[in-house]
Amino acid sequence: QLLEPCGYIYPEFPVVQRGSNFTAICVLKEACLQHYYVNASYIVWKTNHAAVPREQVTVINRTTSSVTFTDVVLPSVQLTCNILSFGQIEQNVYGVTMLSGFPPDKPTNLTCIVNEGKNMLCQWDPGRETYLETNYTLKSEWATEKFPDCQSKHGTSCMVSYMPTYYVNIEVWVEAENALGKVSSESINFDPVDKVKPTPPYNLSVTNSEELSSILKLSWVSSGLGGLLDLKSDIQYRTKDASTWIQVPLEDTMSPRTSFTVQDLKPFTEYVFRIRSIKDSGKGYWSDWSEEASGTTYEDRPSRPPSFWYKTNPSHGQEYRSVRLIWKALPLSEANGKILDYEVILTQSKSVSQTYTVTGTELTVNLTNDRYVASLAARNKVGKSAAAVLTIPSPHVTAAYSVVNLKAFPKDNLLWVEWTPPPKPVSKYILEWCVLSENAPCVEDWQQEDATVNRTHLRGRLLESKCYQITVTPVFATGPGGSESLKAYLKQAAPARGPTVRTKKVGKNEAVLAWDQIPVDDQNGFIRNYSISYRTSVGKEMVVHVDSSHTEYTLSSLSSDTLYMVRMAAYTDEGGKDGPEFTFTTPKFAQGEIE
């Protein structure tokens, strides 16, 4: 059987507002006083098994003791009333759980949304944490009828149990209640149709147009409560590889529609589209985005001709020369489609023009030593580009006019070239470059620049610490001008090895040192200067600096009959590298000298 407690704590279910004071009393039963030979002065209060200081306790009379707590902050405290029976044995009389928290704030920012095909969901901001069990109830009514209450599970939202009725205003509010108080939000009044979030448009399809390479036609299916709502659309698109979306102006898609033509697109480009919808009045919520759909604009004729150049191979006989016509494949943005082939036309004055159809990017022809005009056009399935025209002069004609002040310099991991144009109008410029090496031939790459350009960077994949020979040729209507060349590095490094020094001539007090230039493959940069370090086995080291144009140097004021150790280093802008050490001995006597 349950034992009757010896007394009680009041209140039995204490809930306190945080930061306030709270007093509890423990009342002992008369039978208890007699049985244990105690009174209220024997009561010991404990919170979470720790004794409460005496100064917080007041003995009201022989049966009753009170305890007062100021500025309560702990969320939950076990408060027990205990007696010292027979003056020493502590016995529990009663215990309660004291909770602390706050009354509910007035809920704010109450909003409702009708997700198409679902019941209405309302959300609100409950305000500060109450730390207490708090019930939030969503209330709703028409002017004449109340709807079932919606008990919130999470305290911030609730989905009503009834289907919304459209085109009739509804009043909605939230009531919040806990042990410390009850409060209602402001009510909101609206027609549920103005809170609809439609399901995303679906079956989005994209088709191109053979007539216009700059458009794509979109079509889709909208729901809009099964046609009950008129929806306007929001269309966004991007190229397949882009990460940012381009917005179709919303004013273009304001009227209800299920198709749209997007304009001003690039030819033969894959675009990705997405679409969302909202009630045409703009009230309610945008749907989620549709599934993405992609389409490719139709091809258009290439927008410009390829870069076009030629190289003449040394002729075997006197009558003919082998000419290699070369061109660059157009980038996709200019090809506007799949390039099927290139058309090269060779013409001469009062002669039958000759047309070659080539699938690659070069054509070698045997030409006479007369002047030719070559034209080049790229072709896709829509048509041909404009023609690039090159005059190939007779090899007996000396090229006049070159660029001046040709410079090259690295910047931002690119190798830049700049020049001053020649004094005659230029059609274009050709830049050629290759890696200078003693171990491999100079395999040229090239690029074309417009006549207006006089500063550009090399567009190939360049390597660091390699010496590039760069040539710039202006091209005129009458043919190429003179070529100007220079050497440059994308990035210099210290040489891979230093010079190997030797003696050319050794005298009693001087020695002529000689060395070979470091091979270009090992230079790793422009050799700016050399240092020569020399010493005897006991003397201190001497250093002389020599200009990079020299390949020999005379050491003077040497001691006779002495062993010298010599080492040479070569320096680029990025550092130096020592060559191997070399020793020589000066003779005891000069030539013809006797002891």
């Epitope: 009558e319 002669s351 047309t355 070659y356 030409l367 006479t368």
Partner: nanobody
Framework: QVQLQESGGGLVQPGGSLRLSCAAS????????MSWVRQAPGKGLEWVSA????????YYADSVKGRFTISRDNAKNTLYLQLNSLKTEDTAMYCC??????????????????WGPGTQVTVSS
Amino acid sequence: QVQLQESGGGLVQPGGSLRLSCAASGFTFSSYAMSWVRQAPGKGLEWVSAINSGGASTYYADSVKGRFTISRDNAKNTLYLQLNSLKTEDTAMYCCAKHVTGDYDPSLRYEYNCWGPGTQVTVSS
């Protein structure tokens, strides 16, 4: 300055023969392939025959194959076309034309023109 002067045309009966000549100047004749073309009244230009710079390779349109013969004399800077077994459909203005390279390649496309005065061949009974 390229100059071409055709001669040797005339009026001939069906089955008859003619020899056309083309005197060239203003360029290195021996370095270039040459062609004969013709234009019948109210028709477009039609290629007839071609010969490479050295004279070793010759080419003919199907309509004249076996009847016409092209030749050249590089020493005299002259191109020839021997017309045999002439038919009424061979009636046309005949012109010679200079190519831009030493070889004629049937796989290439050519844009022909009459730069010289041409010589008229009329086949009629």
